[in-house]
Amino acid sequence: IWELKKDVYVVELDWYPDAPGEMVVLTCDTPEEDGITWTLDQSGEVLGSGKTLTIQVKEFGDAGQYTCHKGGEALSHSLLLLHKKEDGIWSTDVLKDQKEPKNKTFLRCEAKNYSGRFTCWWLTTISTDLTFSVKSSRGSSNPQGVTCGAVTLSAERVRGDNKEYEYSVECQEDSACPAAEERLPIEVMVDAIHKLKYENYTSSFFIRDIIKPDPPKNLQLKPLKNSRQVEVSWEYPDTWSTPHSYFSLTFCIQVQGKSKREKKDRIFTDKTSATVICRKNASFSVQAQDRYYSSSWSEWASVPCS
Amino acid sequence: VPGGSSPAWAQCQQLSQKLCTLAWSAHPLVGHMDLREEGDEETTNDVPHIQCGDGCDPQGLRDNSQFCLQRIRQGLIFYEKLLGSDIFTGEPSLLPDSPVGQLHASLLGLSQLLQPEGHHWETQQIPSPSPSQPWQRLLLRFKILRSLQAFVAVAARVFAHGAATLSP
């Protein structure tokens, strides 16, 4: 058993049929010595008396808010949550495995630039009695500060018969150094509490590996005189790190015909303009990636050829 | 470069960008291999990193690029020695067309561009002997290449910025 926060405790249980459970001793936070009784949740049933209460915690029915009373007045509370371990593995019932980039990916994180700011998100099908808290640091043995904001419900989606809820959080490294080579990874830890179930999820990454630029902006087409060709130009996204002579992007461009089956040639360039053949019903697209480190490509920015 | 002269920024830019490409060819991102799970805080501590105080940021380069260039050169020599060691020549066998060979030569080429004959900056201690088991050796290979990818990315940014803003 360990203390999650004041008056909230997590009991770690090996979860299998007829498991013996965990013996827990609760102590009433009071100078009083006599006439103390204990109850669980809203039930008025007295579980025991005295300054301490010893219970055997085996299942969710044994978890909840234990209160010690004297003369009809509540003296202190202890909320017990359960953290299940099945076959040596902590349960992951609350969050959905996003399976990208690999199995057992519950938290996904992205950064738009090297400023030390990043967003993490996760998915669940649970809609009520659910709370999350997030902590983050750079490195684990000698952690450096990362400040995370409040967790927000960022999207709701219908998947077949189920509703899926996406939660997200924004974090900022306290003293980021965008030009340095990261030596220690960022650690993100999410505590999830659903009713009386406690779970924790972690992710470890370098900012450089989660970079995904915003799409290039200001796509423009300029037809060339007496030619089927057009000059296309675009700009670095506003959210990308500066100066661009240092934090450079590379671009992938393509012209896509109306039919998705049509062969599309992709051209890679470090420039912010190109000359292409852009037929009437086609569209021109461009995406960006860090020029020197193969992190994610941005989403496509597109403009119709006509 | 030693003694405060300017490097051939444009040449360094080209070669460092080539290094980036080669480093990613030698070890593309492989989904299931999360090498940080193998206690990375210790493993990569002995490789040279370009840190915050090394003057490799745009402002630091404008003030005095020498500190940064010396740090880059130390790293290049360190990695060049690693890539030539039996970590990479032992099993699992690398074919002669492996990008590791070109990477090794390019690291040497760039470090020489930063230090013409006759000048000798103090260089970093070379790493300890490699493991004997193919499994450990392969893991170390992957870690070195992942770490090199990050190192050469910063070096390439430095030279790109230098070529654009500091060239005579």
């Epitope: - | 099993e91 699992p92 066998s93 074919l95 990008p99």
Partner: antibody, heavy 120, light 107 residues
Framework: QVQLVQSGAEVKKPGSSVKVSCKAS????????IHWMRQAPGQGLEWIGY????????KYNENFKGKVTITADKSTSTAYMELSSLRSEDTAVYYC?????????????WGQGTLVTVSS | DIQMTQSPSSLSASVGDRVTITCKAS??????VAWYQQKPGKVPKLLLF???TRHTGVPDRFSGSGSGTDFTLTISSLQPEDLADYYC?????????FGQGTKLEIK
């Protein structure tokens, strides 16, 4: 896209020689090793060796030394494998293949195979 | 030479079954193992490399595991088109060697 096109099937007498070709396209021929494998009827695969066209250096499986010569012609982007002193046990489908770009020998692209039959 | 001993040499399974093929190397090859599928009359096709990394376009019902000397190819839910011979291959040490193959038949 990368393509490896091999020469057609051959029927040979014991004691004679055969030269199988593998024409490569869709990549820079001198950048990658070309490997040769064989598969006897109903049997598994055996690695014979490779040639690195950039420096014309072959490497052989010891079990095939003296039996096989691997060469490359840069001007036509073609690799060759010559088998000498043919015996009936050399009857097999011979494949050329090129490995992954990262320098390890897992084979992504294969030729269509050339059946060499040795029979008197 | 490193011997790659594959088992079973043949097996018959029904559509939807989970199928496992094993391969044992005669000495440590780290994870330098690839798996190939060869359909009747066709060229071998790469399925997995580094013991467990799926090649582009390979369905996710194919998975691999193992390191050192013991390796496994698993097909989680057998499909009719999986009828083929399967080969493991070590690329750790010269000469590169293959397992003798597993013939997979559909019941």
């Amino acid at each position: 896209q990368v393509q490896l096109v091999q020469s057609g099937a051959e029927v040979k007498k014991p004691g004679s020689s055969v030269k199988v070709s593998c024409k490569a396209s869709g990549y820079t021929f001198t950048d990658q090793t070309i490997h040769w494998m064989r598969q006897a009827p109903g049997q598994g695969l055996e690695w014979i060796g490779y040639i690195y066209p950039r420096d014309d250096s072959p490497k052989y499986n010891e079990n095939f030394k003296g039996k096989v010569t691997i060469t490359a012609d840069k001007s036509t982007s073609t690799a060759y494998m010559e088998l000498s002193s043919l015996r009936s046990e050399d009857t097999a489908v011979y494949y050329c293949a090129i490995p992954d770009r990262s320098g390890y020998a897992w084979f992504i692209y294969w030729g269509q195979g050339t059946l060499v039959t040795v029979s008197s | 030479d490193i011997q790659m001993t594959q088992s079973p040499s043949s097996l018959s399974a029904s559509v939807g079954d989970r199928v496992t093929i094993t391969c044992k190397a005669s000495r440590d090859v780290a994870i330098a193992v690839a798996w190939y599928q060869q359909k009747p009359g066709k060229v071998p096709k790469l399925l997995l490399f580094w013991a467990s990394t799926r090649h582009t376009g390979v369905p996710d019902r194919f998975s691999g595991s193992g390191s050192g000397t013991d390796f496994t190819l698993t097909i989680s839910s057998l499909q009719p088109e999986d009828l083929a011979d399967y080969y493991c291959h070590q690329y750790s040490s010269y000469p590169f060697t293959f397992g003798q193959g597993t013939k997979l038949e559909i019941k």
